[in-house]
C-alpha cells in the first residue's frame, strides 16, 4: 500500500541533492586552501542531519548548528558584499573583484546556492516531489531557515564599510521583507560597522534618475541611521560598464559616470 505523502506547494528537493552538495564541497575545499581541512562527508552528514526525519515546517536554526560549526570560515570582514534581488550581477562582480565576498562565495553559501531540499517527519527519505513554500505553506522550512541562519551570521561578521547591491528596476528597490531587509540589515553590528554603502543598479539604458532618492532607499537610510551606522548610496547607471571598469579602472572610457 503506497504511503500517504504530504503535498507541499513548492518544488521538491533538487535532483541528485546529496551528490551535488558533496561534489560542491569537494570542489570548494580544493579551490580554497584555507578550507582544505574540512571533511566533506562530515559536512554532508551535518547538512542531512538538519532536516532528515524532521517535519519540514518545524525546522529551527538550532538544527543547523552542527553544519554551521563545520562550515566556520573567516572572510575579511571589511570586504563583504550583500545583495538583494540582483544575485547574478553581485556574483559577476566578486568574480572580477576577487578580494570581495558574497555569502555564496563562502563554503556554506556555495553548497546551497540555487538548491531546494526537505525531508519528511519520521522517515529518513528526502522529498523529491514537493517542499514547503515560504508563503503558501510555512516559513520555518529547511531552505528558508538555512538562509536565515547563514545570512544572519554573515551580517554579524561584517565590519567597517559594508556594501549592498540593490536592484533599481524593482518597484521596491529596498524591500523590508527580503533576506537583506529582514535579516541582514538588523544583524549588522554598529560597534563594528561604520557605513553601509548601497549600490543601486539601474536597468534602463537611458535611465539617469538618481535612484538614491527613492522612498525605499530613504527608508533603508532611516533604519540604518537609527542603528548608529552611517549610510551612503551610489547609482550604477551602466552595470556592464561598471564590471568592465572594476576590471580596468584606468581605461579611458571609465573616467566619466558609470
Amino acid at each position: 500500500v503506497p504511503r500517504w505523502r504530504q503535498q507541499w506547494s513548492g518544488p521538491g528537493t533538487t535532483k541528485r541533492f546529496p551528490e551535488t552538495v558533496l561534489a560542491r564541497c569537494v570542489k570548494y575545499t580544493e579551490i580554497h586552501p584555507e578550507m582544505r581541512h574540512v571533511d566533506c562527508q562530515s559536512v554532508w552528514d551535518a547538512f542531512k542531519g538538519a532536516f532528515i526525519s524532521k517535519h519540514p515546517c518545524n525546522i529551527t536554526e538550532e538544527d543547523y548548528q552542527p553544519l554551521m560549526k563545520l562550515g566556520t570560515q573567516t572572510v575579511p570582514c571589511n570586504k563583504i558584499l550583500l545583495w538583494s534581488r540582483i544575485k547574478d550581477l553581485a556574483h559577476q562582480f566578486t568574480q572580477v573583484q576577487r578580494d570581495m565576498f558574497t555569502l555564496e562565495d563562502t563554503l556554506l553559501g556555495y553548497l546551497a546556492d540555487d538548491l531546494t531540499w526537505c525531508g519528511e517527519f519520521n522517515t529518513s527519505k528526502i522529498n523529491y516531489q514537493s517542499c514547503p513554500d515560504w508563503r503558501k505553506d510555512c516559513s520555518n522550512n529547511p531552505v528558508s531557515v538555512f538562509w536565515k541562519t547563514v545570512s544572519r551570521r554573515f551580517a554579524e561578521a561584517a565590519c567597517d564599510v559594508v556594501h549592498v547591491m540593490l536592484n533599481g528596476s524593482r518597484s521596491k528597490i529596498f524591500d523590508k521583507n527580503s533576506t537583506f531587509g529582514s535579516v541582514e540589515v538588523h544583524n549588522l553590528q554598529p560597534e563594528k560597522v561604520q557605513t553601509l554603502e548601497a549600490w543601486v543598479i539601474h536597468g534602463g539604458r537611458e535611465d539617469s534618475r538618481d535612484l538614491c532618492q527613492d522612498p525605499t532607499i530613504k527608508e533603508l537610510e532611516s533604519i540604518i541611521s537609527k542603528r548608529n551606522i552611517q549610510f551612503s548610496c551610489k547609482n550604477i547607471y551602466r552595470p556592464d560598464k561598471f564590471l568592465q571598469c572594476v576590471k580596468n579602472p584606468e581605461d579611458s572610457s571609465c573616467t566619466s559616470e558609470i
Partner: nanobody, 123 residues
C-alpha cells in the same frame, strides 16, 4: 571630511603645474582620493586616484605619461603633477574622496569633494 585643492594658475602650452590637495577628517586609511577635471561645457572627468588601502596609484590612459599623482609621507596631502600642458587641459581641477573599497575613476563614485582650482593653458 574636508578636501582643499590649490596650485592652479595660468601657464603656457608645454609648461607644467603642480596641484595640491589636503585631505582631513578620515580616521583610517580606508579611502581612495582622486583628481578630476571639468572643462567648460564638458562632463567631469577622472584623471587619477590613490587607494590608501594598498598605496596603489591609478592613472587614466588619457593622461598617463603627462599627469602624475603622488602623495606626501604623512598622508594628508596628495599632488597632481601636470606636464606638457595643452590648451585643451584648461579646466577646473578637483580632488575628491570615497570610502568605497572599489577603485574607480568615475566621478559619481566619489562622495566627498573639495572646491576646484582653475588651470588655464594659453597657446
Amino acid at each position: 571630511v574636508q578636501l582643499q585643492a590649490s596650485g592652479g594658475g595660468l601657464v603656457q602650452a608645454g609648461g607644467s603645474l603642480r596641484l595640491s590637495c589636503t585631505v582631513s577628517g578620515f580616521t583610517s586609511d580606508d579611502y581612495t582620493v582622486g583628481w578630476f577635471r571639468q572643462a567648460p561645457g564638458l562632463k567631469r572627468e577622472g584623471l587619477s586616484c590613490l587607494s590608501r588601502r594598498d598605496g596603489r596609484f591609478y592613472h587614466s590612459n588619457s593622461v598617463k605619461g603627462r599627469f602624475t599623482m603622488s602623495s606626501d609621507d604623512n598622508k594628508n596631502t596628495v599632488y597632481l603633477q601636470l606636464d606638457s600642458l595643452k590648451p585643451d587641459d584648461t579646466a577646473v581641477y578637483y580632488c575628491a574622496a570615497t570610502t568605497s573599497v572599489v577603485v574607480l575613476l568615475a566621478p559619481n563614485w566619489y562622495e566627498y569633494w573639495g572646491q576646484g582650482t582653475q588651470v588655464t593653458v594659453s597657446s
